[in-house]
């Protein structure tokens, strides 16, 4: 009787052994141990998750399955051939031996083998379908990720360009803010100074009002006395008129009128018909002392007496008290007219002062004071100014109230330091003050961060040295 036995070999393949008499038939079939069966927990919906499985793993698994399927196919073909060959031999043997049992057993074995092969094929088909399903899903997910990555990359590029634009705008604004900061400091200071000046003015006005009130009281008291005096005077005048009418003495009314040949200022020169710019000789009334001054007969109606000019640095302005008193330099170029002459002139009638300024960038500005005069030498030629207008700052760059004049040998400033020695030139220094038009002359591109230069704070700030300045005076009623 034939013995049929099924066992496993060492490499995990199913082994079918058929014993038939002295012949033994062994069939080796591969077992899909590394493939999951349909009852495996790894089911077809296992790929339905947010994040895809590792793509490389899937590809590897797919390759393994393909190899297994290829092996199976080869095995099946070999098995078919093998069965056919053996069946032929067996059939011959069966016919020879006429043993029906063996045929039945062989048929049974063949049937079993075919069933198992069919089962294996079905399992493989299931696995292949799962793998294909999974691969398709992975491909779709990869495509989705690729699209979202592209979208993100575009967004990042857009944001980067936006950031660059913002950075450019930011640096531009930063520069603007820094520039405004400097202007703001000067403007703030201007406001502070204006406030201080207004407070001083208010307190002065209060004291003047008090004085005026006292004077009104005194005037009221004196009014009656004056009326009596006026009455007495009228009587005296009438008496004198009567006496004069009876008098027989006669007088010659003609007085020789001498032609004016000397001028006190350029306004008088202008009015005499000399309307050309140039150097003229001026003489104060009741004086024989002459000074040479430059007359500007064109600017703002003409008649301007130039008392100071800076234009090229050709004249040294670091001079003594005496030199500033009498004047120095060249009237047709850089010069100082002289404090003594200006003091006497401006105390005889009301004068205006115009200060004309030039910077190194081609800009011009002016400050005009509606009333200007200098005290006498005994009061150190103290400057007095009222009523500022013009384009070189809303606040006066000559400190108010006026200061005494200082030179390198006459320290009359309000500083612990010696302003004239330190900042150079004679000027109405405070401590040391917002201006010095007689400072060191610095050429272009060397004119910034200069503390001893030609300075007009409320136009150009503290460290800027100007290109040119002109100080000119003219009678107020011209």
């Amino acid at each position: 009787y034939n013995n049929f036995r099924k066992s496993m070999d060492s490499i995990g393949k199913k082994q079918y052994q058929v014993q038939h008499g002295s012949c033994s038939y062994t069939f080796l079939l591969p077992e899909m141990d590394n493939c999951r069966s349909s009852s495996s927990p790894y089911v077809s919906n296992a790929v339905q998750r947010d994040a895809p499985l590792e793509y490389d793993d899937s590809v590897q698994r797919l390759q393994v399955l393909e190899n297994i399927m290829e092996n199976n196919t080869q095995w099946l073909m070999k098995l078919e051939n093998y069965i056919q060959d053996n069946m032929k031999k067996e059939m011959v043997e069966i016919q020879q031996n006429a043993v029906q049992n063996q045929t039945a057993v062989m048929i049974e074995i063949g049937t079993n083998l075919l069933n198992q092969t069919a089962e294996q094929t079905r399992k493989l088909t299931d696995v292949e379908a799962q793998v294909l399903n999974q691969t398709t899903r992975l491909e779709l997910q990869l495509l989705e990720h690729s699209l979202s990555t592209n979208k993100l990359e575009k967004q990042i590029l857009d944001q980067t360009s936006e950031i660059n634009k913002l950075q450019d705008k930011n640096s531009f604004l930063e520069k603007k803010v820094l520039a405004m900061e400097d202007k703001h400091i000067i403007q703030l200071q201007s406001i502070k100074e204006e406030k201080d000046q207004l407070q001083v003015l208010v307190s002065k006005q209060n004291s003047i009002i008090e004085e005026l009130e006292k004077k009104i009281v005194t005037a009221t008291v004196n009014n009656s006395v004056l009326q009596k005096q006026q009455h007495d005077l009228m009587e005296t005048v009438n008496n004198l008129l009567t006496m004069m009418s009876t008098s027989n003495s006669a007088k010659d009314p003609t007085v020789a009128k001498g032609e004016q040949i000397s001028f006190r200022d350029c306004a008088e020169v202008f009015k005499s018909g000399h309307t050309t710019n140039g150097v003229y000789t001026l003489t104060l009334p009741n004086s024989t002392e002459e000074v040479k001054a430059y007359c500007d007969m064109e600017a703002g109606g003409g008649g301007w007496t130039i008392i100071q000019r800076r234009e090229d640095g050709s004249v040294d302005f670091q001079r003594t008290w005496k030199e500033y008193k009498v004047g120095f330099g060249n009237p047709s170029g850089e010069y100082w007219l002289g404090n003594e002459f200006v003091s006497q002139l401006t105390n005889q009638q009301r004068y205006v002062l115009k200060i004309h300024l030039k910077d190194w960038e081609g800009n011009e500005a002016y400050s005009l004071y509606e009333h200007f005069y200098l005290s006498s030498e005994e009061l150190n030629y103290r400057i007095h100014l009222k009523g500022l207008t013009g384009t070189a700052g809303k606040i006066s760059s000559i400190s108010q109230p006026g200061n005494d004049f200082s030179t390198k040998d006459a320290d009359n400033d309000k500083c612990i330091c010696k302003c004239s020695q330190m900042l150079t030139g004679g000027w109405w220094f405070d401590a040391c003050g917002p201006s010095n038009l007689n400072g060191m002359y610095y050429p272009q591109r060397q004119n910034t961060n200069k503390f001893n230069g030609i300075k007009w704070y409320y136009w150009k700030g503290s460290g800027y040295s100007l290109k040119g300045t002109t100080m000119m005076i003219r009678p107020a009623g011209f």
Epitope: I185, P434, S462
Partner: nanobody
Framework: EVQLVESGGGLVQPGGSLRLSCAAS????????MSWVRQAPGKGLEWVST????????GYADSVKGRFTISRDNSKNTLYLQMNSLRPEDTAVYYC????????WGQGTTVTVSS
Amino acid sequence: EVQLVESGGGLVQPGGSLRLSCAASGFTFSSYAMSWVRQAPGKGLEWVSTINSGGGRTGYADSVKGRFTISRDNSKNTLYLQMNSLRPEDTAVYYCNADHPQGYWGQGTTVTVSS
């Protein structure tokens, strides 16, 4: 009354260091840019360095760049100048100055660099 008082000057060897101070009073120190200016014997004023009111921006003359450092402490109303790697040509009277319309000045402090 406005006052600027400089201190910290003295005699130092070439390559040495000094720290100058300037104590301010009588005005709103924190509202103004401040500068250090020096005057060498027989010479005019020379700008050294400036710092803005908040202390965030500074400027230096080429002759001192990389050696001198300006700073300020607005809570103490004080301006400083740290001077390193001093040279004989740094010998001068050093003044602090406020960028105020008055351009306030102190009496100065003398720095002598000599071996």
